[in-house]
């Protein structure tokens, strides 16, 4: 078997064996090593010497195999834009941010740049559960049969109606999507002016 070429090596067709870890240098028509994540090019390659890499200085990073001559500056998550940190910046990865609780991403440019408050879901509805928190605004869906939700809230969940018989009571008024079942003591009639979820 033919020995594997080690950078720097000549390339006539302008392509390199390992696209992730090597790049084509057109001036010398050679393939040179890229620098690994967390490093940058401190000396470019030549026909007789491969790329020399150096580690990124503190508070900077490069995420990919690269032939950059600088590292990118770490940026904090901007709380004014509604963002919070979920993982710190290291030499190999930028700071990872997400929307603060109760917010969703309203502006996206490769990553989220601005979060806004989730809209309220009115009584009788709840926010549809999403795969990823903070990805989009609330989509309110009606409570399913036998459930209610009685507030305007971005996060309140529909709750099952109270089962009066479980408490030794009887139903005085059925539950709706916006209110719980009203229960009463089986021995007492329910006066028409009385309301509330439980009458004793």
């Amino acid at each position: 078997s033919q020995p594997q070429a080690v950078p720097p090596y000549a390339s006539e067709n302008q392509t390199c064996r390992d696209q992730e870890k090597e790049y084509y240098e057109p001036q010398h028509r050679i393939c040179c090593s890229r620098c690994p994540p967390g490093t940058y090019v401190s000396a470019k390659c030549s026909r007789i010497r491969d790329t020399v890499c150096a580690t990124c200085a503190e508070n900077s990073y490069n995420e990919h195999w690269n032939y950059l001559t600088i590292c990118q500056l770490c940026r904090p998550c901007d709380p004014v834009m509604g963002l919070e940190e979920i993982a710190p910046c290291t030499s190999k990865r930028k700071t990872q941010c997400r929307c603060q609780p109760g917010m969703f991403c309203a502006a996206w440019a490769l990553e989220c740049t601005h979060c806004e408050l989730l809209s309220d879901c009115p009584p009788g509805t709840e926010a549809e559960l999403k795969d990823e928190v903070g990805k989009g605004n609330n989509h309110c869906v009606p409570c399913k049969a036998g459930h209610f939700q009685n507030t305007s809230s971005p996060s309140a969940r529909c709750q099952p109606h109270t089962r009066c018989e479980n408490q030794g009571l009887v139903e005085a008024a059925p539950g709706t999507a916006q209110s719980d079942t009203t229960c009463k003591n089986p021995l007492e009639p329910l006066p028409p002016e009385m309301s509330g979820t439980m009458l004793m």
Epitope: A57, E58, I86, A87, P88, T90, S91, K92, R93, Q96
Partner: antibody, heavy 121, light 113 residues
């Protein structure tokens, strides 16, 4: 040759203090984060504390927060761990470990041989 | 904290046979921006410090024999020793470095059957 050598371990009474040192050689010490990782007898590995290359960022496991302090002297190529209010459960071999990063959140590519800390009355 | 769970706790394999160790993280450790899993494997022989053998979940550290390989993504990872040698008897640990604090699995002891 890249090398880490720990020292300062020993027997100490509960409530006592100890200062561990880790002398580094063979690499640009100030460019890399360092951590302390411990291993109780017959048990697994537990990260204790980490410090960034400049010393500007530090972090601690909840189990040692407020009792242990990590520091470094880049002019002496030395990492330290000041351990106060020691408890029996701190008994372990303490390893210093180098990260391939200025941040301690990375793979630990070089480890020292470890120094034994025994907390007992 | 991200919890790392290894299985099995120990395994005995005949010389020349395959050994497989699993590691599961309680949270995703794949960073979508660079498609890298922030997971490493260490080998610890009796009386010695741990030694890095795999990083980025599947990249072998230089000098590590090619019988060691790492695979998996997201939350489920595997370390495979394709043909167990006597010198591979050790405890193997996975570790995530996706988020602070870095956390280790409880270890898997590999012995010869």
């Amino acid at each position: 040759e890249v090398q880490l050598v720990e020292s300062g371990g020993g027997l100490v009474q509960p409530g006592g203090s100890l200062r561990l040192s880790c002398a580094a050689s063979g690499f640009t010490f100030s460019s890399y984060a360092m951590s302390w990782v411990r291993q109780a007898p017959g048990k697994g590995l537990e990260w204790v504390s980490g410090i960034s290359g400049s010393g500007g960022r530090t972090n601690y496991a909840d189990s040692v927060k407020g009792r242990f302090t990590i520091s470094r002297d880049n002019s002496k190529n030395t990492l330290y761990l000041q351990m106060n209010s020691l408890r029996a459960e701190d008994t372990a071999v303490y390893y210093c470990a180098k990260s391939d990063n200025w941040h301690y959140l990375d793979a630990f590519d070089i480890w020292g041989q470890g120094t034994m800390v025994t907390v007992s009355s | 904290d991200i919890v790392m769970t290894q299985s099995p706790d120990s395994l005995a394999v005949s010389l020349g046979e395959r050994a497989t160790i699993n590691c599961k993280s309680s949270q995703n450790v794949l960073y979508s921006s660079n498609n890298k899993n922030y997971l490493t494997w260490y080998q610890q022989k009796p009386g010695q410090p741990p030694k890095l053998i795999i990083y980025w979940a599947s990249t072998r550290e230089s000098g590590v024999p090619d019988r060691f390989s790492g695979s998996g993504s997201g939350t489920d990872f595997t370390l495979t020793i394709s043909s167990l040698q006597a010198e591979d008897v050790a405890v193997y640990y996975c570790q995530q470095y996706f988020n602070t604090p870095p956390t280790f699995g409880q270890g898997t002891k590999v012995e010869i059957k």
